[in-house]
Interface confidence: low
């Protein structure tokens, strides 16, 4: 439906706050290095304007659309080229190339500080002097550091922050109360960036029928009494959806989210039982808890998917007639009977059945070509499985912190060539499959692990392709979306690596380490076993296991220690060499 | 916009054949799910039978399957449902609805469809 003015339509549909929240998400996500107070300069700008084309539609420029209103307003920032770079060549194309530019240059990992929490005093001080900005301030923050975070989902997220500081700034215990609620926000939005980074890859490296494929499977597993129809009528809403924000459509992206919700709600008899209370909560929480809902029950007696995708003379002519929409009422029909596969793994079969059909459908005789195709699904379907049991064993042996040690040493031996960094953050996340699903029954695992996985080899790939090192990393990342991590999982020890030089600074260790959490003196260990890795990609898991135990009590020793930074310089030599020695180096 | 137009209703004895046509304007048939639906007095708006746009892959309520076939003239774009061994309770209002866009697959579900026809009467009985 055509309006005449786009930014009077979105304002009227969004209202002026969260109009104004989404513009500032949008251009923090753009622009991730540009001070807080110019966006809000920006922002205010584009709201004025916005309110004079909300009284008149046909006022100048108010028949623009979005992205030339938006850009136009983004390549006014004066320090564009010096802040930049080539960015700012973006500003002399015209839409839509200039916002394709624009969004080629989002980074995955801007050069920004680390966010380190002020002391809770502080931001109740903050938070009461000035609530607006407080809370414009934690948009723009975690806009710019996750530019492509679900613009709708920050709302949410903006708004449980805000209930956080309302109730605990009051509290007689500001910190307990403040504290672990700051922690769950933090930890679930790093969750929903990564979850919402893959839905923008899928969309944007594999395109939308990837998408969709991903979604039909998803959808029919949680709403598994609802029709072909009804799912893909909801797949195709929501991949609007996600093409609008994943392209920086903030303002549509939202209203179109909103809209579904809608939808759901009051269709909910024809999709899901599961629904009834999301559907009482307000907009924001009732799409939050839409998209987490649990998985309905199946329908009872569902027949043998036999009869309609190997068994019927028909096959061949209904996959001719309209491949997509048959290999979509597969997909779905499998979903729907499987919520304990993983998405991914349904996406493979999908794929193997696609694969026979195009090779058999052609063939003398295709039944008796396609007749044994369910076989082929096993291997597949035992792959995941054994993994999952083998790694939830090793898990459950060594703990959180020792499986994520096991990961980063499997790890940098298969891609050696990634920074360091980015294999200490990767595998540290891939541990954390280990707390996050092994505790599941055996039903729910797999869902849980393959797919968070899945999530976890995106931010891999979302940052090696930043500064691309490894050709086999390059190559598991773009051949198959659903084969990721089956391909990383094949990766063997890189043989072609040359070992790193030794480089005794890097082993260098000073008494700041003491004052760390806990958390950052994991990662601080963690980091030197990678290096270790690196120098010595041929050491036993013994080897390395005695140096990092020689490590932690080089570190406990020296915390306890009357002259703490002595102690790092004389017994670090001793344990540098001792090292050395042991690794042979 | 898709206009429907729906006709063939008509009395007919209980074992006795019908076909009614629908139709459409505004669209190509061919492009659209379309299905037709039936309201037997008093009661709700029940599926009878419908088809995939582009694809031929039909669907049917368990109570007609065997009996009634949907098909449709992409020439004339028409949509027909051929009602065979018709029973007392098939007399209803029969209803052709249509679902332009992807996706191109009919609905069991009403309320997808926003375009509907007036109605054709089939009454069943001796």
């Known amino acids: 439906d055509a309006h005449k003015s786009e930014v009077a339509h979105r304002f009227k549909d969004l209202g002026e706050e969260n109009f104004k929240a989404l513009v500032l998400i949008a251009f923090a996500q753009y622009l991730q290095q540009c001070p807080f107070e110019d966006h809000v300069k920006l922002v205010n700008e584009v709201t004025e304007f916005a309110k004079t084309c909300v009284a008149d539609e046909s006022a100048e420029n108010c028949d623009k659309s979005l992205h030339t209103l938006f850009g136009d307003k983004l390549c006014t920032v004066a320090t564009l080229r010096e802040t930049y770079g080539e960015m700012a060549d973006c500003c002399a194309k015209q839409e839509p190339e200039r916002n394709e530019c624009f969004l080629q240059h989002k980074d995955d990992n801007p050069n920004l500080p680390r966010l380190v929490r002020p002391e809770v005093d502080v931001m109740c001080t903050a938070f009461h002097d000035n609530e607006e900005t407080f809370l414009k301030k934690y948009l723009y923050e975690i806009a710019r550091r996750h530019p492509y975070f679900y613009a709708p989902e920050l709302l949410f997220f903006a708004k449980r922050y805000k209930a956080a500081f309302t109730e605990c700034c009051q509290a007689a215990d500001k910190a307990a109360c403040l504290l672990p609620k700051l922690d769950e926000l933090r930890d679930e939005g790093k969750a929903s960036s990564a979850k919402q980074r893959l839905k923008c890859a899928s969309l944007q490296k594999f395109g939308e029928r990837a998408f969709k494929a991903w979604a039909v499977a998803r959808l029919s597993q949680r709403f598994p009494k609802a029709e072909f129809a009804e799912v893909s009528k909801l797949v195709t809403d929501l991949t609007k959806v996600h093409t609008e924000c994943c392209h920086g459509d903030l303002l549509e992206c939202a209203d179109d989210r909103a809209d579904l919700a809608k939808y759901i709600c009051e269709n909910q008899d024809s999709i899901s039982s599961k629904l009834k209370e999301c559907c009482e909560k307000p907009l924001l929480e009732k799409s939050h808890c839409i998209a987490e809902v649990e998985n309905d029950e199946m329908p009872a007696d569902l027949p043998s998917l036999a009869a309609d995708f190997v068994e019927s003379k028909d096959v061949c002519k209904n996959y001719a007639e309209a491949k997509d929409v048959f290999l979509g009422m597969f997909l779905y029909e499998y979903a729907r009977r499987h919520p304990d596969y993983s998405v991914v793994l349904l996406l493979r079969l999908a794929k193997t059945y696609e694969t026979t059909l195009e090779k058999c459908c052609a063939a003398a005789d295709p039944h008796e070509c396609y007749a044994k195709v369910f076989d082929e699904f096993k291997p597949l379907v035992e792959e995941p499985q054994n993994l999952i049991k083998q790694n939830c064993e090793l898990f459950e042996q060594l703990g959180e912190y020792k499986f994520q040690n096991a990961l980063l040493v499997r790890y940098t031996k298969k891609v050696p060539q990634v920074s360091t960094p980015t294999l200490v953050e990767v595998s540290r996340n891939l541990g954390k499959v280990g707390s996050k699903c092994c505790k599941h029954p055996e039903a729910k695992r797999m869902p849980c692990a393959e797919d968070y996985l899945s999530v976890v080899l995106n931010q891999l790939c979302v940052l090696h392709e930043k500064t691309p090192v490894s050709d086999r990393v390059t190559k598991c990342c773009t051949e198959s979306l659903v084969n990721r991590r089956p391909c990383f999982s094949a990766l063997e020890v890189d043989e072609t690596y040359v070992p790193k030089e030794f480089n005794a600074e890097t082993f260098t260790f000073h008494a700041d380490i003491c004052t760390l959490s806990e958390k950052e003196r994991q990662i601080k260990k963690q980091t030197a076993l990678v290096e270790l890795v690196k120098h010595k990609p041929k050491a036993t898991k013994e080897q390395l296991k005695a140096v990092m135990d020689d490590f932690a009590a080089f570190v406990e020793k020296c915390c306890k220690a009357d002259d703490k930074e002595t102690c790092f310089a004389e017994e670090g030599k001793k344990l540098v060499a001792a090292s050395q020695a042991a690794l042979g180096l | 916009e898709v206009q429907l137009l729906e006709s063939g209703g008509g009395l007919v004895q209980p074992g006795g054949s019908l076909r009614l046509s629908c139709a459409a304007s505004?669209?190509?048939?061919?492009?659209?799910?379309v299905a037709w639906f039936r309201q037997a007095p008093g009661k709700g708006r029940e599926f009878v039978a419908g088809?995939?746009?582009?694809?031929?892959?039909?669907y049917y309520a368990d109570s007609v399957k065997g009996r009634f076939t949907i098909s449709r003239d992409n020439s004339k774009n028409t949509l027909y449902l051929q009602m065979n061994s018709l029973r007392p309770e098939d007399t209803a209002v029969y209803y052709c609805?249509?679902?332009?866009?992807?996706?191109?697959?009919?609905?069991?579900?009403?309320?997808?469809?926003?375009?509907w026809g007036q109605g054709t009467l089939v009454t069943v009985s001796s």
């Open positions: 609805a249509a679902r332009p866009g992807r996706p191109l697959i009919t609905s069991k579900v009403a309320e997808l469809y926003p375009y």
């Open positions: 505004g669209r190509y048939i061919d492009e659209t799910a």
């Open positions: 088809i995939g746009g582009g694809v031929d892959i039909t």
